[in-house]
């Protein structure tokens, strides 16, 4: 099924996708829609590059935050609330009868956690929890780390968006 | 709400062009994609093609060399042409659109004899 | 092309019983999959698209699961106007294709 990212209400989210540009500088068309990638296009589009720019978006809490010019499309959605959660497709709209790369991810947005952060997580989240963690303004900040991710349980994961408050991050679920 | 109608004939002669309309209420053929659809007397269904927004097309490969479709925005239609038909192409044949073909015509049954 | 291999061609079943429709691709499909509902005289009526999601104003009988190449379409609590043909369509590719259909009858 989709990926799951975990943000908190108020804090940004970051949703990844990246295509490679092929030759270099070759942009092609991106959408990013509310819900799963259709048949054609997306539904319900939220932002729209063309070959040269971003030339569509519904609201000014959408962005591309990445080098967009590389084939980095990930979706930044500032200022989350309870209805931002859901899946949303990233296309790729590469030309040809099969070339479109489809990407569903899934947001869910949680209430602010009302948890003292555990003084044992005041550390590097990114190492603590590699392929887990992604912020909004940096890109993701995921580790080629080998092994299976550590059993996180919701009261770790409502102490983890505690910590990242500030920076906006948003946790990623496998 | 979309609202799609087929027309054109209903009996064809073998190595003849079939043309059909699709007429569109409701939404404009400047926006989105706008679908062919045809469902053989056996219960089979063939996607044939589109044409889109910004007037683009793509065509099912099995079709590529007899057919074409086409638009008129100031009428908000669109056509399918289908040249050098067989017994082969009788089906009925529907108009459709939507992010998952939501939006169907309701059909028009071509038979294709002599 | 990738085939949508639909079972069973056809199927029988009582008001307010349950029946499953299956569809496997000849591929993995990604859970692009659709299922429609065919009536004589109208055009096919979207259910449910990505496998699962039942289209607005479709009942909660109706149900879809299913990933990689195996998917399946159930309805629970049949009603007399449930009878028709179902067919499955995959979307993971401009190469649409349809599965062979499904006529559901009353027993």
């Known amino acids: 099924s989709e990926v799951e990212y975990i943000a908190e209400v108020g804090q940004n989210a970051y949703l990844p996708c990246s295509y490679t540009p092929a030759p270099p500088g070759n942009l092609v068309p991106v959408c990013w829609g509310k819900g799963a990638c259709p048949v054609f296009d997306c539904s319900n589009v939220v932002l729209r590059t063309d070959n040269r720019d971003v030339n569509d978006r519904t609201s000014g809490r959408y962005w591309l935050k990445g080098d967009f010019h590389k084939g980095d499309v990930s979706l930044t959605i500032e200022n989350v609330t309870l209805a931002d959660s859901g899946v949303y497709c990233c296309r790729i709209q590469i030309p040809g009868i099969m070339n479109d790369e489809k990407h569903n991810v899934k947001l869910v947005v949680i209430k602010p956690a009302k948890v003292t952060p555990a003084p044992t997580l005041q550390r590097d989240l990114t190492s603590a929890f590699p392929r887990m963690l992604t912020t909004g303004e940096h890109g993701p900040a995921e580790t080629q780390t080998p092994g299976s991710l550590p059993d996180v349980n919701l009261t770790q994961i409502f102490t983890l968006t505690n910590e990242l408050r500030d920076s906006g991050a948003t946790i990623r679920t496998a | 709400e979309v609202q799609l109608q087929e027309s054109g004939p209903s009996l064809v002669k073998p190595s003849q062009t079939l043309s059909l309309t699709c007429s569109v209420t409701?939404?404009?053929?400047?926006?989105?994609?706008w679908n062919w659809i045809r469902k053989f007397p056996g219960n089979k269904l063939e996607y044939m093609g589109y044409i889109n927004y910004s007037g683009s097309t793509y065509y099912n490969p099995s079709l590529k060399s007899r057919i074409s479709i086409t638009r008129d925005t100031s009428k908000n239609q669109y056509y399918l042409q289908l040249n050098s038909v067989t017994t082969e192409d009788t089906a009925t044949y529907y108009c459709a659109t939507g992010n998952h073909f939501d939006y169907w015509g309701q059909g028009t049954t071509l038979t294709v004899s002599s | 092309d990738i085939q949508m291999t639909q079972s069973p061609s056809s199927l029988s079943a009582s008001l307010g019983g349950k029946v499953t429709i299956t569809c496997k691709a000849s591929q993995d499909i990604n859970k692009y999959i659709a299922w429609y509902q065919h009536k004589p005289g109208k055009g096919p009526r979207l259910l449910i698209h990505y496998t699962s999601t039942l289209q607005p104003g479709i009942p909660s009988r109706f149900s879809g699961s299913g990933s990689g190449t195996d998917y399946s379409f159930s309805i629970s609590n049949l009603e007399p106007e449930d009878f028709a043909t179902y067919y499955c369509l995959q979307y993971d590719n401009l190469l649409f294709t349809f599965g062979s259909g499904t006529k559901l009858e009353i027993k």
């Open positions: 409701g939404d404009s053929i400047t926006s989105g994609y």
